[in-house]
């Protein structure tokens, strides 16, 4: 539909178009599986429009359903690293807080190959926290084209 | 001015253990994964154990996994490898290097390295 | 593990010639990920290339190098007196990185 020129005027953020794309910051200490994520134009093609960033981790500022895509590559990486351990090394996205709403979004395997990349519409409320965690040993590359981690608001 | 300054070689028997220190300087350490690299008495480089910046993420050289340690202590830029269960093949310079930032294991600094010899 | 052939083991050269090196790999190495490093007696190697083509930070435009898939090369152009040492591929593509055992460039 076509906006209005009073909506034209208004910025993004009003019109519930929250967006972000983020780059690989750190992993964390040990016994803690989580990427942590860093965005703003000072660090190049990664920004924050809305949703805003929590220790590292994605927290969403308005209720609707939004594409959430995610691509990491591995930098120590090798099929025998990602097809044969004991452990696959797996990521998975998902809503880690509030505990009342903790549900897995996304699982991802490592089958002999170096990156992997999904994406999927779902609905988040203000206030979750997204959470990316990456088993095993292995450590993703912080090259911002092979990693990076985003959401964009698409309809209420 | 990035320096890494690695001590605690010398000459070790066979099944003895020795600790190797990396101390780092002029980067924040945090930030970057780490490596120990060998290289034996007119041999090649051997890359031998990584970690990364915040310490969570280890990774060996099937020559050395199960023997030795790999560990950081962020609050004193130090780097370090524990080496147990020590054999005469394990004879070598090592050298503590620095990932680039992209924490793929190729090198923009090298330390001058410190000599461990393991013999009876 | 991918495995990384030198040649020649060593290159004889004068001051001011143009020294050729060749690094090939066993299998593909991901992504062009292949360093080169200069190292001299009793020191530390230094990062000259990296991603195959791209020159480290301080390195003159003099080394250069290209390739991909199996064959990578170093060019050292108008050779210096200080470009007279052994010179180590490493692929950082594949788990575990290796390194090749070096090709000496020596005075002729």
């Known amino acids: 539909q076509r906006l209005s020129r009073a909506q034209q005027q208004l910025p993004l953020e009003s019109l519930g178009w929250d967006i972000a794309e983020l780059q690989l910051n750190h992993t964390g200490p040990q016994q803690d599986p989580r990427l942590y994520w860093q965005g703003g134009p000072a660090l190049g093609r990664s920004f924050l429009r809305g949703p805003e960033l929590d220790k590292g981790q994605l927290r969403i500022r308005r209720d609707g359903i939004y594409m959430v895509h995610i691509q990491v590559t591995l930098a120590i990486c090798s099929s025998t690293s990602t097809s044969r351990h004991h452990h696959p090394t797996t990521l998975a996205v998902g809503i880690c807080s509030p505990a009342s709403r903790s549900i897995s979004l996304l699982r991802l395997s490592f089958h002999q190959g170096c990156t992997i990349a999904s994406q999927r519409l779902t609905p988040l409320a203000r206030g979750d926290t997204l959470c990316t965690n990456l088993t095993g040993t292995l450590l993703p590359s912080r090259n911002t084209d092979e990693t990076f981690f985003g959401v964009q608001w698409v309809r209420p | 001015e990035v320096q890494l300054l690695e001590s605690g070689g010398g000459l070790v028997q066979p099944g003895g253990s020795l600790r190797l220190s990396c101390a780092a300087s002029g980067f924040t350490f945090s930030t970057y994964a780490m490596s120990w690299v060998r290289q034996a008495p007119g041999k090649c480089l051997e890359w031998v154990s990584l970690?990364?910046?915040?310490?969570?993420?280890?990774y060996y050289a099937e020559s050395v996994k199960g023997r030795f340690t790999i560990s950081r202590d962020n609050s004193k830029n130090t780097l370090y490898l524990q080496m147990n269960s020590l054999r005469a093949e394990d004879t070598a310079v090592y050298y503590c290097?620095?990932?680039?930032?992209?924490?793929?294991?190729?090198?923009?600094?090298w330390g001058q390295g410190t000599l461990v010899t393991v013999s009876s | 593990e991918i495995v990384l052939t030198q040649s020649p083991g060593t290159l004889s050269l004068s001051p001011g010639e143009r020294a050729t090196l060749s690094c090939r790999a066993s299998?593909?190495?991901?992504?062009?990920?292949l360093a080169w490093y200069q190292q001299k007696p009793g020191q530390a190697p230094r990062l000259l290339i990296y991603?195959?083509?791209s020159r480290a930070t301080g390195i003159p435009d003099r080394f250069s190098g290209s390739g991909s898939g199996t064959d990578f090369t170093l060019t050292i152009n108008r050779l210096e007196p200080e470009d007279f040492a052994v010179y180590y591929c490493?692929?950082?593509?594949?788990?575990?990185?290796?390194f090749g055992c070096g090709t000496k460039v020596d005075i002729k």
């Open positions: 299998q593909g190495v991901r992504s062009s990920y």
């Open positions: 991603g195959a083509s």
């Open positions: 970690i990364s910046g915040s310490g969570g993420r280890t």
């Open positions: 490493q692929q950082y593509g594949s788990s575990p990185p290796t």
């Open positions: 290097a620095k990932h680039d930032y992209s924490n793929y294991p190729y090198f923009d600094y």
